[in-house]
Interface confidence: low
């Protein structure tokens, strides 16, 4: 029964993030005659994939197509036979390829060539596997967002998102925080961008948008965690790592080989006495904290504002949908709730780092120990990034939502990045495309 | 140096047992989860079974369900597989392998049966042990 064909007239299409830590399969579904309506495109599957993310396996590229294999399929079942050879399929890479292209253009080259390859064999319409930038990450998040959120409808919703209703066309702020990268994209009240690198000129719908946004590629989770891993080494007496992000008596091995792999802490690389060393926890919100605000450089600016690292920031404007790691670590945390206050939040991150291991291990025992272990990094992380890296502040704080899905569909740049390909976003009625895209690759 | 070495491989006749042992040396066993994986002889790697970190999940590839069972024990750093009712198709080597990577969040929490792909995801191997079933 799957395979066959609807009785109503419905398009399908797909986007694959392949990100730092793994990937991810969107199949998207919209009434045919209403493409260009705003908000009709709403998920109907995600498939995680099995496995790292794509860039783990420039060694290894022939195992590529197993590792896609299982999605693919799922994806053949959902959507109905008579619908393959019209749906498109689009590869998105984000940061992780972005990493690994900066080691190795051709090695980046030969796993997305494979990734095409494989991409190719099934039914479906294939589009092309590319690298986006970190731009268009920040700008299709926002997309995304406002697009399910009604923002950039003119008319009377059809739907009510009741915990972010505004009752207004001011349109949300994206905060994205992925594996590798971190993105910030807002409408800023006061439209002076002052780096052209940031700025972001739409016509969506019939009104202008000029969007700042930005992506500190090296600052996700996962490669803040080894900056400030490879920066709390250097001072180190020996290869004990006594590590406040870490719950009291957590022990890990740790690689030198591993630590230096990537790009991200080259800045911190040096010649260590040892090849291993081992991380034991002090479990210490406040130093944690500490430590991590040494990742970011604040004593140069070179604009009126700034985030960290010399980048320009304007001053916050609005509410902010905060997606991917930031709704994922703070939701295990239990600390979306709009409720809470950021003065809270701090508070419950000092108590949930100052918790044994013992007993956080046996407090969440169905939960893989390796993520277990860094929860406390990453809500420190999280509320560093926030407060110290982006200037909001406690009064602002109750501006940032968390947000897992907005009418059942992912918040992320994947389904912003489709109906840009696929010319559903018209720009009066439908004329022009909100962002160009580059050649695949 | 970290490493992990398996041992216990050896010739059994069909219905018979074996214990395969997997210890490591440079790291603690407890903080990671441990797969086993076998490779016949002409064929691509596959995911057997698997343990938690903690011990309280295994997991087991439908072919072996039933017949073998993983196991640690903390005080010798030492992860096991016990091989019962072996069959000739159990034939093949028997590989450990350690999920080490220090990068956070590389998966959700998964099943650790599967062919290469998975293969790909863990870190650290040893160099095999060879179990061959025959009468």
């Known amino acids: 029964t799957q395979n066959k064909a609807l009785p109503e007239n419905v398009k399908y299409g797909i986007v694959l993030d392949a990100g730092s830590s793994h990937t991810s399969l969107y199949i998207y579904k919209w009434p045919a005659e209403k493409e260009n309506d705003t908000g009709v495109v709403h998920q109907v599957e995600e498939c995680r994939v099995k496995g790292p993310g794509i860039s783990k396996f420039v060694q290894k590229v022939n195992e590529i197509g197993i590792y896609l294999t299982d999605c693919m399929e799922r994806a053949r079942e959902v959507i109905p036979r008579s619908q393959h050879q019209e749906t498109p399929v689009y590869l998105g890479a984000t940061a992780g390829m972005r990493l690994l292209r900066m080691e190795s253009e051709e090695l980046a080259d030969r796993v997305l060539d494979v990734v095409e390859r494989s991409l190719s064999n099934y039914p479906f319409d294939f589009q092309g596997a590319r690298i986006i930038t970190g731009q268009e990450e920040g700008a299709y998040g926002w997309i995304t967002i406002n697009y399910l959120l009604g923002k950039f409808s003119q008319k009377t919703r059809w739907f009510s998102i009741v915990p972010y209703e505004t009752n207004n066309q001011e349109t949300f702020g994206a905060l994205d925080l992925g594996g590798a990268s971190t993105q910030v994209t807002f409408v800023p009240q006061n439209q002076t961008i002052e780096s052209p690198d940031n700025a972001l000129q739409f016509r969506l719908y019939g009104k202008d948008y000029n969007v700042y946004t930005h992506s500190f590629l090296c600052y996700g989770k996962d490669q803040a965690l080894w900056q400030k891993l490879a920066k709390d080494i250097q001072v180190a007496s020996n290869e004990i790592l006594r590590d406040p992000c870490f719950h009291p008596g957590y022990k890990k091995v740790v690689n030198v080989s591993d630590l230096y792999k990537t790009p991200c802490t080259k800045r911190f690389e040096m010649t260590l006495p040892f090849q291993q060393f081992e991380i034991q926890g002090i479990g210490n919100y406040q130093q944690c904290h500490q430590s991590i605000l040494e990742l970011f450089n604040t004593s140069y600016c070179p604009y009126s504002q700034c985030a960290f690292n010399g980048i320009f920031l304007p001053p916050l404007q609005g509410d902010f949908g905060a997606f991917s790691a930031f709704y994922f670590v703070m939701k295990f945390l239990n600390l979306t709730s709009e409720k809470v206050s950021q003065e809270k939040v701090t508070e419950m991150m000092k108590k949930f780092c100052a918790q044994p291991w013992e007993e956080i291990k046996t407090s969440y025992a169905g939960v893989k120990e390796k993520y277990l272990s860094e929860y406390c990094f990453s809500g420190t992380y999280i509320l560093s990034l926030l407060l110290q890296g982006y200037h909001f502040t406690a009064d602002s704080w109750e501006h940032i939502h968390f947000i897992g899905k907005i009418q059942g569909s992912d918040a992320g740049w994947t389904l912003g990045y489709m109906l840009n390909l696929t010319n559903m976003i018209p720009a009066e009625q439908p004329l022009s495309t909100p962002l160009s895209h580059s050649t695949y690759v | 140096e970290v490493q992990v070495v398996e041992s216990g491989g050896g010739l059994v006749q069909p219905g018979g047992s074996l214990r395969l042992s997997c210890a490591a040396s440079g790291f603690t066993l407890d903080y990671y989860a441990i797969a086993w994986f076998r490779q016949a002889p002409g064929k691509g790697r596959e995911g057997v079974s698997c343990?938690?970190?903690?011990?309280?999940?295994?997991n087991y590839a439908d072919s072996v369900k039933g017949r073998f069972t993983a196991s640690r024990d903390t005080a010798k750093n030492t992860v096991y597989l016990q091989m019962n009712s072996l069959k000739p198709e159990d034939t093949a080597v028997y590989y450990c392998a350690a999920d080490l990577s220090a990068a956070p969040y590389n998966d959700a929490v998964r099943s650790c049966t599967g062919g290469n792909r998975l293969a790909a995801t863990y870190d650290f191997w040893g160099q095999g042990t060879q179990v061959t079933v025959s009468s």
């Open positions: 343990i938690s970190s903690s011990g309280g999940s295994t």
